[in-house]
Interface confidence: low
Amino acid sequence: VPSIPLDVLSASNSSSQLIVKWNPPSLPNGNLSYYIVRWQRQPQDGYLYRHNYCSKDKIPIRKYADGTIDIEEVTENPKTEVCGGEKGPCCACPKTEAEKQAEKEEAEYRKVFENFLHNSIFVPRPERKRRDVMQVANTTMSSRSRNTTAADTYNITDPEELETEYPFFESRVDNKERTVISNLRPFTLYRIDIHSCNHEAEKLGCSASNFVFARTMPAEGADDIPGPVTWEPRPENSIFLKWPEPENPNGLILMYEIKYGSQVEDQRECVSRQEYRKYGGAKLNRLNPGNYTARIQATSLSGNGSWTDPVFFYVQAKTGYENFIH
């Protein structure tokens, strides 16, 4: 049996392809015949599903041309947060020691997360759910579990979050040390394994694998919301907006932003992934009577999609005595 292929590397030139290149094994132990290339889609980090990206005015924004994202504090038009019940806008709640510690850890995580997106060769994930250790090339890497505050995370089970083992796909590569893997999902992480096989492969099998993690590039338009935005009137001067989610987004959708207003679209509402998954849309509350327009934009791991076409809706004035006392 030959030794493992050397120097496996991968790069992406499109949202659906990964190019893989390697060097022959140092010990072919006979005539090298072919290589087996196997690839497997990797689940997203559970943290990305559970974190509420609308909390504490943090929104991921596209910051770098290479598609890495950061989470920034928003100072203009901050989204109001409810302090102790639904009593309308109020000042920011004082931070507890636990929250301060969580923010410190959040900053650490952001650095790791930025690196995670920046490197085409994957750095081990900062958090694992069901595995405390991960064997990487005979090295055990343990990872510290992160403490997060309840305000930042959800316990809602996202069907996509369950760390399913995606199937491996396989192809045979003859007489060369490079290949192109196609039909992949955009901005998605894959594990690619390469096995060396010599003339005795059928009898003795092939080598153990050398592997690499690589991410496909983001796809243009993949984060755009398909189809129309619709609305339904609700009691108490509110309406419910519904929209379909992008079918094959860049990685996953972290949040949605609604821009709405009666004269100009000067109000903003952030809708977390978890809220959207629960309700299929979002409720806009405490609207003054009148005609409104709204647009919606999704934010994925790689940045923002396009704003939707405007949806027009109206809030009726209450009539009669009821209107008089208001």
Epitope: S10, A11, E177, R178, T179, V180
Partner: antibody, heavy 118, light 112 residues
Framework: EVQLVESGPGLVKPSGTLSLTCAVS?????????WSWVRQPPGKGLEWIGE???????NYNPSLKSRVTISVDKSKNQFSLKLSSVTAADTAVYYC???????????WGQGTTVTVSS | DVVMTQSPLSLPVTPGEPASISCRSS???????????LDWYLQKPGQSPQLLIY???NRASGVPDRFSGSGSGTDFTLKISRVEAEDVGVYYC?????????FGQGTKVEIK
């Protein structure tokens, strides 16, 4: 934007060793690329000399393999070419290039002329 | 080793007219994944080579769409739909299927 700059002596004596360095700026030599050397004798075509990955793995042109050494210095973000036992036939413009995997050699240095003469 | 052969070696062109360069490899550059491991480069007078086409038919970043690559297996063609004065120089094909990487001998394109 990645840029490559070749440097080294422009004149080498026959039977001596040609030594060139390619400085990588605007990017890391440890990124997922191979780094190549290509040469072009006066009035002739391009000839691939060899390539190196940041781990130190190399591939060489068999026609030059016995005389060529390509090395990498990650701390200086550069890679180097050494060609021993040179003759007048090694007189050429030497280019370093980034071999962006199968996307081709998408970044090239400006080239440096090396003359082998006594 | 793979040997690359280009023709013609010299190509006088008229601005605004199309031009075509042929490249032949001594063995197939078509991999079982369906991609042809062939690149095209242009070296303008006094300059370093620049990448035009990779994987047989994919235009590199910033390359005008008047350049196109086609072909499969052992026979490849670079076409310029309408030659412009800035397109003069030497065009090289290169096989990237296996090491040693190998260039064709070059085709010199000049204005008539």
């Amino acid at each position: 934007e990645v840029q490559l700059v070749e440097s080294g002596p422009g004149l080498v004596k026959p039977s001596g060793t040609l030594s060139l360095t390619c400085a990588v700026s605007g990017g890391s030599i440890s990124s997922s690329n191979w780094w190549s050397w290509v040469r072009q004798p006066p009035g002739k075509g391009l000839e691939w000399i060899g390539e190196i990955y940041h781990s130190g793995s190399t591939n060489y042109n068999p026609s030059l393999k016995s005389r060529v050494t390509i090395s990498v210095d990650k701390s200086k973000n550069q890679f180097s070419l050494k060609l021993s036992s040179v003759t007048a036939a090694d007189t050429a413009v030497y280019y370093c290039a980034r071999d962006y995997d199968i996307f081709g050699m998408d970044v090239w240095g400006q080239g440096t002329t090396v003359t082998v003469s006594s | 080793d793979v040997v690359m052969t280009q023709s013609p070696l010299s190509l006088p062109v008229t601005p605004g007219e199309p031009a075509s360069i042929s490249c032949r490899s001594s063995q197939s550059l078509l991999h079982s994944n369906g991609y042809n491991y062939l690149d095209w480069y242009l070296q303008k007078p006094g300059q370093s080579p620049q990448l035009l086409i990779y994987l047989g038919s994919n235009r590199a970043s910033g390359v005008p769409d008047r350049f196109s690559g086609s072909g499969s297996g052992t026979d490849f063609t670079l076409k310029i739909s309408r030659v412009e004065a800035e397109d003069v120089g030497v065009y090289y094909c290169m096989q990237a299927l296996q090491t040693p990487l190998a260039f064709g001998q070059g085709t010199k394109v000049e204005i008539k």
